[in-house]
């Protein structure tokens, strides 16, 4: 008799794929138009692009009125006219809903100022946040983000209160908190009193880019957080290129999309947007490179392969990889909610299996080093439910040159420098 199927876990929308942060709507829109189209309206015109990325939610803003460091001139219920109007926003919400893209609003109060939380007026600000949560939930947003919570006194209790408001409205609403901290104990203390909170942090940003260290960070985090749902990113707001050299971007994309939890990216991560390559651009909000004319000030500074347009036409581009990974992440049960087992594969490598019941299983092998390596996959580390076959089919490699779909012998697996492999194999009873 066939074994009984394992019961599917309850899945919320943020469990089903990536979140995409647009911290600066003006930069995302591009500047050629000046302010002639409100950035919120401009974003509406980019929803088809975002659909093509298969992202499940947009984390927008902040877009509220905030006169730097002036709590009286900070209004979380009003959209700053630099970004558009409430009507523009309502229209965006409706259009996003039609495309099954959720909208999360960043309500970090003093986003233009020195201290995001007006350190001396915490209670006033907390009241404003409560009012804003209720107002924007009624307006139809799907969740909220607050950043820099390490600067918020009594963050845990405030977050618990805000979570209650959010979840009280609907279990389908999400609260994301962001911190600059990379300290696991600090992160755990924020999480312990807020069970459904999604937390973004700098935890992975000091991974030192070695396989062993990354493996140890990931496994420590998963062990410490138990079976709670988590998110994966390198920071609460910044681009991947702020932390990673270009040669590791593909590897990290593969890892973030295949770890158990919600991958969170910033606009431009899908094309390797790098402020440092664009003279004069602010590190925190470089202009999105839609095409070569998106950064017009220095002719020749932007080549086609740095842009959305150029990379869309190249099946070997970072953007094409992002789209493929996002697609896999959103439809394969083992990647959606499968179990995770990391195991030894040799120095410099990080490897793990994702599996769910009798569904197709995935093996990820990542070479963080700058030398080619042979993988010595230690299947003895794995439980019986996640045993390795002799061969697995190559779904994709982060490097060109391999024949996709071909079976690879796992005992003879060799990886190029900075190469990541995503392999698939069937469940065997």
């Amino acid at each position: 008799r066939a074994p009984r199927c394992r019961e599917l876990p309850a899945q919320k929308w943020w469990h089903t794929g990536a979140l995409y942060r647009i911290g600066d709507l003006q930069a995302f829109q591009g500047h050629g138009a000046g302010n002639l189209a409100a950035p919120i309206s401009g974003l509406k015109g980019r929803l088809d692009y975002l659909s093509s990325l298969k992202v499940k939610g947009l984390v927008l803003g902040p877009i509220h009125k905030n006169q730097k460091d002036d709590v009286a001139q900070t209004d979380l219920l009003q959209i700053d006219p630099n970004f558009g109007s409430k009507e523009d926003f309502d229209s965006l919400l409706q259009s996003a809903k039609k495309k099954s893209i959720r909208v999360i609003l960043d309500l970090t109060p003093n986003y233009r100022g020195e201290n995001s939380w007006f350190s001396t007026q915490v209670d006033t600000v907390a009241t404003k946040v409560k009012d804003a949560l209720e107002f924007w939930l009624q307006a139809g947003v799907d969740g909220f983000q607050v950043r820099d919570i390490e600067n918020l006194k009594d963050a845990s209790s405030f977050l618990a209160e805000w979570q209650n408001i959010t979840k009280g409205f609907s279990e389908d609403r999400l609260l994301i908190a962001g911190t600059n901290s990379s300290d696991l104990q600090q992160i755990l203390s924020l999480l312990e009193s807020n069970k459904d909170l999604l937390l973004t942090s700098s935890y992975l940003s000091d991974s030192g880019s070695t396989g062993e260290h990354t493996k140890s960070l990931v496994t420590q985090y998963l062990n410490a957080t138990g079976n709670r749902w988590c998110s994966w990113s390198l920071s609460q707001a910044r681009l991947l290129t702020s932390f990673l050299p270009a040669q590791l971007l593909r590897l990290y994309q593969l890892m973030l999309f295949t770890l158990p939890g919600t991958p969170v990216f910033s606009y431009g991560d899908e094309i390797g947007l790098d402020a440092a390559a664009l003279p004069g651009q602010p590190m925190e909000a470089p202009v999105m490179l839609w095409d070569e004319s998106s950064f017009p000030d220095i002719p020749g500074a932007v080549s086609a392969n740095m842009t959305v347009k150029g990379q869309s036409e190249d099946p070997g581009s970072l953007l094409s990889l992002f789209r493929r990974l996002s697609d896999q992440r959103s439809k394969e049960r083992s990647l959606l909610h499968g179990d995770f087992h990391a195991f030894s594969a040799g120095p410099g490598l990080f490897s793990y299996i994702r599996h769910w019941d009798q569904n197709e299983r995935f093996l990820v092998v990542l070479n963080f080093g700058d030398v080619g390596l042979s993988a010595g996959l230690q299947a003895s580390d794995l439980p019986a439910s996640a045993s390795l076959p002799a061969k697995a089919d190559l779904l994709l490699s982060t490097q060109p040159g391999r024949e996709e779909g071909s079976p690879l012998e796992l005992e003879r697996l060799k990886l190029e420098p900075h190469e990541g492999l995503l392999l698939r194999f069937p469940y065997a009873a």
């Epitope: 600066d24 500047h31 050629g32 730097k68 006219p81 630099n82 602010p282 000030d297």
Partner: antibody, heavy 125, light 108 residues
Framework: QVQLVQSGAEVKRPGASVKVSCKAS????????IHWLRQAPGQGLEWMGW????????NYIQKFQGRVTMTRDTSISTAYMDLSRLRSDDTAVFYC??????????????????WGQGTLVTVSS | EIVLTQSPGTLSLSPGERATLSCRAS???????LAWYQQKPGQAPRLLIY???SRATGIPDRFSGSGSGTDFTLTISRLEPEDFAVYYC?????????FGQGTKVEIK
């Protein structure tokens, strides 16, 4: 550096048309809208509208609709402003201009920073 | 459309003096999108201030802008001989973009 160089002065009869050109250099022409403005003798500045050189999309203010046509030729990085059915009160200096992107205090800003030298169009019988 | 009214029409001052120019809007203008320009005879306008208070590249610090809502001010702390010109305010936050009629700063 950014330069917008306009065509020379024109004298036209009432009822005629005039086409003023604006050649851009020092940046990627398709990356910024070109705005057109006019200034009658001894008067203030009046914004007429814009053209997006990338798409060719235009936006004209009500007052000029039906009489103004803005076009571009991306192969030579040049924008054109054509004003038809000229009247004597159209006598003015016409300017093309381009925004500059400034990033200040967390906000991007887009003022008209780069201007052509101006083209005087005299309408006289 | 937003109508901008500048005052005074003419300001007669001596070099070294302080000049205060006013620009009033018929309805609220996002302070992020108010600019001031200087224009000398036979020349194109030159951007001085954008976002109501930020100086454009290369503009000396004797020029400063302030204001919000419907009332904006351009101040020239000490007039230099090259500052005698016509000054325009402009809003570029809502279409159509509009200019004030100008204030002429002349030598007394």
């Amino acid at each position: 550096q950014v330069q917008l160089v306009q065509s020379g002065a024109e004298v036209k009869r009432p009822g005629a048309s005039v086409k003023v050109s604006c050649k851009a250099s020092g940046y990627i022409f398709t990356g910024y809208y070109i705005h057109w403005l006019r200034q009658a003798p001894g008067q203030g500045l009046e914004w007429m509208g814009w053209i997006n050189p990338n798409s060719g999309d235009t936006n004209y203010i009500q007052k000029f609709q039906g009489r103004v046509t803005m076009t571009r030729d991306t192969s030579i990085s040049t924008a054109y402003m054509d004003l038809s059915r000229l009247r004597s009160d159209d006598t003015a200096v016409f300017y093309c201009a381009r925004i500059q992107v400034y990033y200040d205090g967390g906000i991007y800003n887009y003022p008209l920073h780069h201007w052509g030298q101006g083209t005087l169009v005299t309408v006289s019988s | 459309e937003i109508v901008l009214t500048q005052s005074p029409g003419t300001l007669s001052l001596s070099p070294g003096e302080r000049a205060t120019l006013s620009c009033r809007a018929s309805q609220s203008v996002s302070s992020s999108y108010l600019a001031w320009y200087q224009q000398k005879p036979g020349q194109a306008p030159r951007l001085l201030i954008y976002g109501a208070s930020s100086r454009a590249t290369g503009i000396p610090d004797r020029f400063s802008g302030s204001g919000s809502g419907t009332d904006f001010t351009l101040t020239i702390s000490r007039l230099e001989p090259e500052d005698f010109a016509v000054y325009y305010c402009q809003q570029y936050g809502s279409s159509p973009w509009t200019f004030g009629q100008g204030t002429k700063v002349e030598i007394k």
